[in-house]
Amino acid sequence: VPRWRQQWSGPGTTKRFPETVLARCVKYTEIHPEMRHVDCQSVWDAFKGAFISKHPCNITEEDYQPLMKLGTQTVPCNKILLWSRIKDLAHQFTQVQRDMFTLEDTLLGYLADDLTWCGEFNTSKINYQSCPDWRKDCSNNPVSVFWKTVSRRFAEAACDVVHVMLNGSRSKIFDKNSTFGSVEVHNLQPEKVQTLEAWVIHGGREDSRDLCQDPTIKELESIISKRNIQFSCKNIYRPDKFLQCVKNPEDSSCTSEI
């Protein structure tokens, strides 16, 4: 007789999830010498231990502590790039500007990027059929709690000038309900962070409006200022071209008005 299984509203665990996590861990530790000491089997065991046999609406940050400990990593605290609703460009950017880091450039972020996972209460099975949706089911699900935990730690580690890439094509350029707006902004440490510098990425080809004057950016400025952190903002009107110019600043098209 088939066991009754809870049907959640979100997609199920990514297929070949254990193999993917393990393979990513091995690849990452090979590429990053400072993480060569990491035992990837232990990392997978700790990852699995955070959600297997637990109700997928009852996950806590505490569940992820063994994984956090194994994935402890030092990135230059003054070279951190946060992002909101513009992940692909942020990642393209750190591939060019190799001395800056997004969360997904760290081991733990790299392991989980674009993956979904959950288990079931009292069974050691991984649920490949469905997982809880943050809105429709519950917020304390394995994926959401993981990203909340690693995002908080990443923001807490930041110092000096912290950069954030924001999507200027969205109705809310700064969204208080995003991970950046709800977690990272509130976990920047004013005693370490001097300035938050927002880069507003334009979508339209001929869009030369100053999106730094957008009401949601003013709201972000207000939140940051109240936390005794300075705020600055710049428009990136041509992200494709900007990326090229970061890669090759000598290119005459970066400065020539013709």
Epitope: Q97, I236, Y237, K241, F242, C245, V246, P249, C254
Partner: nanobody, 123 residues
Framework: DVQLQASGGGSVQAGGSLRLSCAAS????????MGWFRQEPGKERRFVAS???????TYAESVKGRFTISRDNAKNTMYLQMNNLKPEDTAVYYC?????????????????WGQGTQVTVSS
């Protein structure tokens, strides 16, 4: 707070020279690309020259061979040596700083602007 203080502007005859300075505070100067822009009355601000944190330089075509940009990281200051000045160089000159790269303004704003210094070249 980040501050960029431009100075050294003035009036000069065509063929003369001026040296502009931009003193920076509140930022890790040696990590920043620095640049100069200029704005003629009724026109848009335009790129003049930039110097990267590595020391590499870029110039607008119209000033190549006449202007030299430099920086002194120990003094947190950037300079623009302007020789063989022409009446068409008359403008308000602004310094700028950016963590990454200084581009023309149709691509991206710099992270920080200084206030302007007036340069007037008469024939």
């Amino acid at each position: 707070d980040v501050q960029l203080q431009a100075s050294g502007g003035g009036s000069v005859q065509a063929g003369g020279s001026l040296r502009l300075s931009c003193a920076a505070s509140g930022l890790s100067f040696s990590d920043y690309a620095m640049g100069w822009f200029r704005q003629e009355p009724g026109k848009e601000r335009r790129f003049v020259a930039s110097i990267r944190s590595s020391g590499g330089t870029t110039y607008a075509e119209s000033v190549k061979g006449r202007f030299t940009i430099s920086r002194d990281n120990a003094k947190n200051t950037m300079y623009l040596q302007m020789n063989n000045l022409k009446p068409e160089d008359t403008a308000v000159y602004y310094c700028a700083a950016d963590r990454l790269v200084i581009t023309k303004l149709s691509i991206a704003d710099p992270g920080y602007w200084g206030q302007g210094t007036q340069v007037t070249v008469s024939s």
